[in-house]
Amino acid sequence: QFLKEGQLAAGTCEIVTLDRCCNKNRRTIARQTARCACRKGQIAGTTRARPACVDARIIKTKQWCDMLPCLEGEGCDLLINRSGWTCTQPGGRIKTTTVS
């Protein structure tokens, strides 16, 4: 089974664009676009801080931490209203991701 040029293996993703901007109040806002070839029952999400195909139920229920979106050793918490999640590093630094 050979992949054509530009074709993704089933269940995988690639980053298409990564924009960093607006360093306000010591905050960097990043917007990332990914291209995924997800299997039936999966949808594009984030695992270990990288684009990944995840169980579609996770997105439907907004249980974002079930994607394992944070790096190993970081703590994941849902934002109020399940609008996204935070990843807390051992040193206390917090990275917030909102889903739009």
């Epitope: 293996a9 089933a10 269940g11 995988t12 695992t47 139920r57 249980q63 394992l68 703590g75 994941c76």
Partner: antibody
């Protein structure tokens, strides 16, 4: 280094419920998926199910009507309940950590296994 | 369910030999294939994930290959500790299914 330890009764009577607990030490239970697998005597491995940090689950359809996997993050434990057991449920039961290696979910840390015999 | 079929079911070899175990999926699973080693009385041990990526701490004499429906595990220069049962497992669907196992013993 993460270690897993299964615990529970080694003998269960037919029609009763098999209950096992897996205690995770050396790491947070919230950072991975967790799984139960079993192996009947002299046979191969059978996947029972997964549990996610939120408590959401995926089960093997062949066992779905009888199985419940739950998690207690405060104790760093997850558990298996299998109801209405019969002799065919006699097996070594393993708990395992499921690691998302990029896109490839694999069970990279296993408990040593606990033998459960179903007999009256 | 995806069915995983291993061949052969058993295999006899000598220390120093090179052996290959095959695993076939009943439908395409891309490279979502893991290999485990199990010695008697012990828990399985992850050897390879993603069809070809060696798990940390696993000797380089182990290698995996394949994609789609056909996969292989190769051990070059067998060592005494390699005589065990090997299982493939797909991670592309629910339920996760294992092959029936290949028992490797000393000739």
């Amino acid at each position: 280094q993460v270690q897993l330890q299964e615990s529970g009764p080694g003998l269960v009577k037919p029609s009763e419920t098999l209950s096992l607990t897996c205690t995770v030490s050396g790491g947070s239970i919230s950072s991975y998926y967790w799984s139960w697998i079993r192996q009947p005597p002299g046979k191969g491995l059978e996947w029972i199910g997964y549990i996610y940090p939120s408590g959401s689950t995926n089960y093997n359809p062949s066992l779905k009507s009888r199985v419940t996997i739950s998690v207690d993050t405060s104790k760093n434990q997850f558990s298996l309940n299998l109801k209405s057991v019969t002799a065919v449920d006699t097996a070594v039961y393993y708990c395992a950590r499921v690691n998302p290696f990029g896109y490839y979910y694999a069970m990279d840390v296993w408990g040593q296994g606990t033998t459960v015999t179903v007999s009256s | 369910d995806i069915q995983m079929t291993q061949s052969p079911s058993s295999l006899s070899a000598s220390v120093g030999d090179r052996i290959t175990i095959s695993c076939r999926a009943s439908q395409s699973i891309s490279t979502s294939l893991n290999w485990y080693q199990q010695t008697p009385g012990k828990a399985p041990r992850l050897l390879i994930y993603g069809a070809s990526t060696l798990q940390s701490g696993v000797p380089s004499r182990f290698s995996g290959g394949g994609s789609g429906t056909d996969f292989s595990l190769t051990i070059t220069s067998l060592q005494p500790e390699d005589f065990a049962t090997y299982y493939c497992q797909e991670s592309a669907s629910i339920p996760r299914t294992f092959g029936q196992g290949t028992k490797l013993d000393i000739k």
